[in-house]
């Protein structure tokens, strides 16, 4: 919608455009209008761009009016939120950017017989892009002066210079996305595709045998299994076999049979022959043992001379018997072969909760700290270990000890500093606890032991040029005399800042005002009005850039008018033979100064930053972890002190590393158990606990220790056509298109012929960021008017 807001009106005499008084009568003495004020309201007409404004004709973009909003003179700049002085013209077409605006101030006659009368009218032709910012315009000629502001805003969910790009955020089964400032869809985490309704499967999920409907999932096709659907399912019942394709059973070495369950090497697998017997495979699951002398049985398990093999362990002595052998064990050992250590801790002889450790033919007591001796029956002197830190003395007690603390300390070992901060510090000061005392750290602007005193910042008389100083908390304010400004009243007010002069006019600062020196073709207080050169006589062609016309506002009686063939970004230079060249403004080039120079040519953006070209300027969109005009500064990711429990932080690129202390683990030293939690790996990365560290498996499009750095791969090769700039966006990308191009990859030529710029049945030819009118017979000019 196009919005216009009336800001002020100055009609000192209360006159109409025709010289009459609003109230009708003049004072015979001073010829001023009598006090019956004008009842002022405004009419607005918005139409297509006209280089020569015509008052008639339809208001093709819309028209409207205000109610009566004031008398002769009024100022509405302060009355925000008052809609009486606002006219809103909605439009349902693509905004063409260039326009002509007619604004008229009228006097309401308040009766049905007498028609309303015009006070003053202003016209303005220009170009305006959709923005929340207002553009202020002034009408400073004629009987009345008025000021108004205009802006064009896109409806909700519409974007672009033409307000014709639609994007409405959504988070449902149709799509999961937000919209960026250009109206491009940005997928929520876990989703991808043009509509952000295709789930990003688990990292590593087989594209051939796995799929997903939900982010992070991996559903296997029939015949496939595993976390990533990359393992085939073997034939049911397959024992010692594998598969390359589903339902196979390919036997491992030394296994046979349809289900690979027949052992072809029983000897190697089970080693059944004992006592040095030699094993021979005789068939699937069959074997035979050849026993050495003195042994027999299917597995050579029967010893004919039992004691020959030293069956008694741990220095036990062997006796052959009719049943084989018998062992006589050395002290501390038992069992048929003396291999069982007798438990000397049964019963437990350790007192006072001591832990018994069984030894061979004996035991050892591990005593709690307060006890000592063979069976923990003796009281230990804990004071020998010097447990008292900040104490006068240590006293040994039975099964305990006592520390006599120095002033300011407490706790069993006198190692806790008593907190002496009990709210003594005033004015939001922070308190630092000391030993047996405290100190107040005052916020700026306060002083004193308890920060009870407000510092007088005016004491040094900081205000210049007669400014009056007002003391405030941690600051002062200078109230400046007329004509001075700045925080110290150090600036003589510059009415040329910001520059009110339009169309390249030079601004001159005066004591209480400014003056604009207008270029040839413009007039008005701010040089905002195109002069109508054709109000008088016909024109004469001087050269390929200039025409002359008779004029009574120049000494020679001739006014020279320059051609606008070089458009808004250049000046025409005449050449011989009816030719011309264009002198381009900074930032533009081309025959007609229609091409924006690529200021990104020199690759000014560092550290992987993406350069977006502007008019004689550029902007760097920094890679994750970098900032600054050229992406030269590594953002300090340690600034928020992310490491807990005494961990030390080390800044990385878009990441940090915590050096954990005292057994703490995890990305931020937050856990005693695991290196991983749901926040360790970013952008859908999977975290693996590797004991003393963690490892992140990143999804496509991300890399770095915590999947925090976007790979450039989505922008390689550059998917953006027609000079568009590619910006990495995780696994995806966004194209910032050059003027004249649009679409997700800048492949669509903007329709510069919308809406119908050619008049009088002229045909519009659309080009790359330009259009040309082919006029019907009898018509000429850039728009056939």
């Amino acid at each position: 919608q196009f919005e216009l807001e009336i800001l002020s009106m100055q009609n000192v005499n209360g006159e109409l455009q025709n010289g009459n008084c609003c109230g009708g009568a003049r004072n015979p003495g001073d010829r001023k209008c009598t006090r019956d004020e004008c009842d002022t309201y405004f009419k607005v007409c918005l139409k297509e761009y006209q280089s020569r404004v015509t008052a008639g004709g339809p208001c093709s973009f819309g028209s409207g009016s205000t109610p009566v909003i004031g008398g002769n003179t009024f100022n509405l700049k302060a009355s925000r939120g008052n809609d009486r002085n606002r006219i809103v013209l909605p439009f349902s077409f693509a905004w063409p950017r260039s326009y002509t605006l007619l604004v008229e101030a009228w006097d309401s006659s308040n009766d049905t017989v007498q028609p309303d009368s015009i006070i003053e009218k202003a016209s303005h032709s220009g170009m305006i892009n959709p923005s929340r910012q207002w553009q202020t315009l002034k009408q400073n000629t004629g009987v009345a002066h008025f000021e108004y502001q205009i802006r064009v805003t896109c409806d909700d969910y519409y974007y672009g210079f033409g307000c014709n790009k639609f994007c409405r955020p959504r988070d449902d089964f149709f799509g999961h996305y937000a919209c960026d400032q250009n109206g491009n869809k940005t997928c929520m985490e876990g989703w991808m595709g043009p509509e952000c309704n295709r789930a990003i499967c688990r990292q590593g999920c087989s594209p051939k045998h796995g799929s997903c409907k939900l982010p992070g999932d991996c559903r296997c096709q029939y015949g496939w299994q595993g976390l990533y659907c990359d393992k085939c399912i073997p034939h049911p019942g397959c024992v010692h076999g594998i598969c390359n394709e589903p339902w196979q059973c390919l036997c491992e070495t030394n296994w046979g049979g349809q289900l690979c369950d027949k052992d072809l090497n029983y000897c190697g697998t089970h080693q059944p022959c004992l006592n040095g017997g030699t094993c021979s495979n005789t068939g699937p699951d069959k074997y035979q043992c050849s026993c050495p002398e003195g042994y027999s049985g299917p597995n050579c398990e029967i010893a004919e001379h039992a004691c020959l093999s030293d069956p008694c362990h741990n220095r036990g002595s062997c006796k052959e018997t009719s049943l084989g052998f018998e062992c006589e064990c050395s002290p501390g050992w038992t069992g048929p072969t003396c291999s069982t250590n007798i438990d000397d801790c049964s019963p437990n002889n350790c007192s006072h909760g001591g832990t018994c450790q069984d030894l061979v033919n004996g035991f050892k007591c591990v005593c709690p700290p307060q006890w000592t001796g063979k069976t923990c029956q003796l009281d230990a002197n804990e004071c020998e270990a010097k447990p008292c830190v900040n104490a006068k003395s240590c006293k040994n007690l039975i099964a305990s000890y006592y520390c006599d603390c120095l002033p300011g300390w407490m706790g069993q070992n006198c190692d806790i500093n008593i907190n002496d901060c009990l709210g003594q510090c005033q004015n939001d000061a922070s308190c630092r606890d000391l030993v047996n005392g405290y100190r107040c750290i005052c916020p700026p602007g306060y002083a004193g032991d308890h920060c009870e005193r407000d510092i007088d910042e005016c004491a040094s008389n900081p205000c210049l040029n007669g400014g009056h100083c007002q003391n405030e908390i941690n600051r002062f304010q200078c109230l400046c005399p007329t004509g001075f400004s700045g925080n110290l009243c150090q600036l003589d007010i510059d009415y040329c800042e910001p520059n009110p002069c339009q169309n390249g006019a030079q601004c001159y600062n005066r004591a209480s005002d400014y003056f604009c020196k207008c270029p040839e073709d413009y007039e008005g207080k701010n040089c905002s009005h195109l002069k109508d050169h054709c109000r008088t006589t016909p024109c004469e062609v001087i050269d390929s850039c200039t025409v002359a016309m008779a004029s009574n506002d120049t000494p020679e009686g001739v006014r020279y008018i320059s051609s606008n063939v070089c458009g808004p970004h250049g000046k025409c230079k005449s050449q011989s033979g009816g030719k011309f060249t264009c002198d381009c403004n900074k930032g533009f080039t081309g025959t007609y100064c229609h091409e924006n120079i690529n200021d990104c040519e020199s690759n000014p953006c560092r550290n992987g930053g993406t350069c977006i070209d502007g008019v004689n300027s550029y902007k760097c969109i920094c890679s994750d972890g970098w900032e600054g005009a050229y992406c030269e500064t590594n953002i300090n990711d340690c600034s928020q002190n992310p490491c807990h429990n005494g961990g030390t932080c080390r800044d990385l690129v878009n990441d940090f590393y915590c050096d954990c202390k005292n057994g703490w683990k995890g990305k931020t030293c937050h856990s005693r158990d695991s290196q991983c939690d749901e926040a360790t790996c970013n952008n859908g990365g999977t975290c693996y606990d590797e004991g003393d560290a963690f490892k992140c498996m990143c999804p496509g499009g991300w890399e770095g220790t915590t999947c925090n750095i976007a790979r450039n791969s989505s922008c390689l090769p550059n998917p953006c056509h027609n000079g568009g700039t590619c910006v990495v966006n995780g696994e995806s990308f966004t194209c910032v298109c050059k003027e004249g191009w649009e679409g997700p990859i800048c492949a669509q030529n903007t329709n510069d012929c919308s809406p119908h710029p050619c008049y009088n049945s002229g045909t519009c030819v659309d080009g790359d960021n330009w259009y040309r009118c082919e006029c019907a017979p009898g018509f000429a000019g850039p728009d056939c008017r």
Epitope: F166, R168, P169, R170, D171, D172, F173, F174, G175, E195, N197, A199, K213, L214, G216, D217
Partner: antibody, heavy 119, light 107 residues
Framework: EVQLLESGGGLVQPGGSLRLSCAAS????????MSWVRQAPGKGLEWVSS????????YYADSVKGRFTISRDNSKNTLYLQMNSLRAEDTAVYYC????????????WGQGTLVTVSS | DIQMTQSPSSLSASVGDRVTITCRAS??????LNWYQQKPGKAPKLLIY???SLQSGVPSRFSGSGSGTDFTLTISSLQPEDFATYYC?????????FGQGTKVEIK
């Protein structure tokens, strides 16, 4: 006040066709996704089809894919369901419902229209 | 497709009772879960969306909780007008699926 009014239900023979309409009022129809949900006699709710606000995307339940077509006319504030090759198991009360662009919930429902497929 | 399983399929309770109905999804659906109430011969009515957000105009005795695969609808103090059938529904991905319903009857 949001209102959704279904019409077009009735008795039809197996293999026949019907076209259901849903007239919407009380909200900006062109800003919301719309859906059809049905309920067979004595049974639970079954989602049939959905269409997003501009009509660019449509989804269907497997049981009706290829036989039913969802469409909308934003200038008339009307949602349609064209049902062809009807079967006995399509007998149900058909509800139209609107969805805001977040979370996909059905925040308003029509009163329903009964479709009976029988010979 | 994502299966939604409600339990119990029916329950008897008295006015003033605290009633809990659970809904389980066959896969994690984050918070994309909605609850509806339906009375005989009437259209369903939305109670809770996004697992725990109360639809405007719905009494505060209704509340929802859960995330991932397990969700709960709680009626803190059952009123006479609350005897009805309750359905859960997932809305993260098509096809949209409903639970089989839980009928709350007067004891």
């Amino acid at each position: 006040e949001v209102q959704l009014l279904e019409s077009g239900g009735g008795l039809v023979q197996p293999g026949g066709s019907l076209r259901l309409s849903c007239a919407a009022s009380g909200f900006t129809f062109s800003s919301y996704a719309m859906s059809w949900v049905r309920q067979a006699p004595g049974k639970g709710l079954e989602w049939v089809s959905s269409i997003e606000q501009m009509g660019w995307q449509t989804y269907y339940a497997d049981s009706v894919k290829g036989r039913f077509t969802i469409s909308r006319d934003n200038s008339k504030n009307t949602l349609y369901l064209q049902m062809n090759s009807l079967r006995a198991e399509d007998t149900a009360v058909y509800y139209c419902a609107k969805s805001p662009p977040y979370y996909g919930q059905f925040d308003y429902w029509g009163q329903g229209t009964l479709v009976t497929v029988s010979s | 497709d994502i299966q939604m399983t409600q339990s119990p399929s029916s329950l008897s309770a008295s006015v003033g009772d605290r009633v809990t109905i659970t809904c389980r999804a066959s896969q994690s659906i984050s918070s994309y879960l909605n609850w509806y109430q339906q009375k005989p011969g009437k259209a369903p009515k939305l109670l809770i969306y996004a697992a725990s957000s109360l639809q405007s105009g719905v009494p505060s005795r209704f509340s929802g909780s859960g995330s991932g695969t397990d969700f709960t609808l709680t009626i803190s103090s059952l009123q006479p007008e609350d005897f009805a059938t309750y359905y859960c529904q997932q809305s993260v991905v098509a096809p949209l699926t409903f639970g089989q319903g839980t009928k709350v009857e007067i004891k």
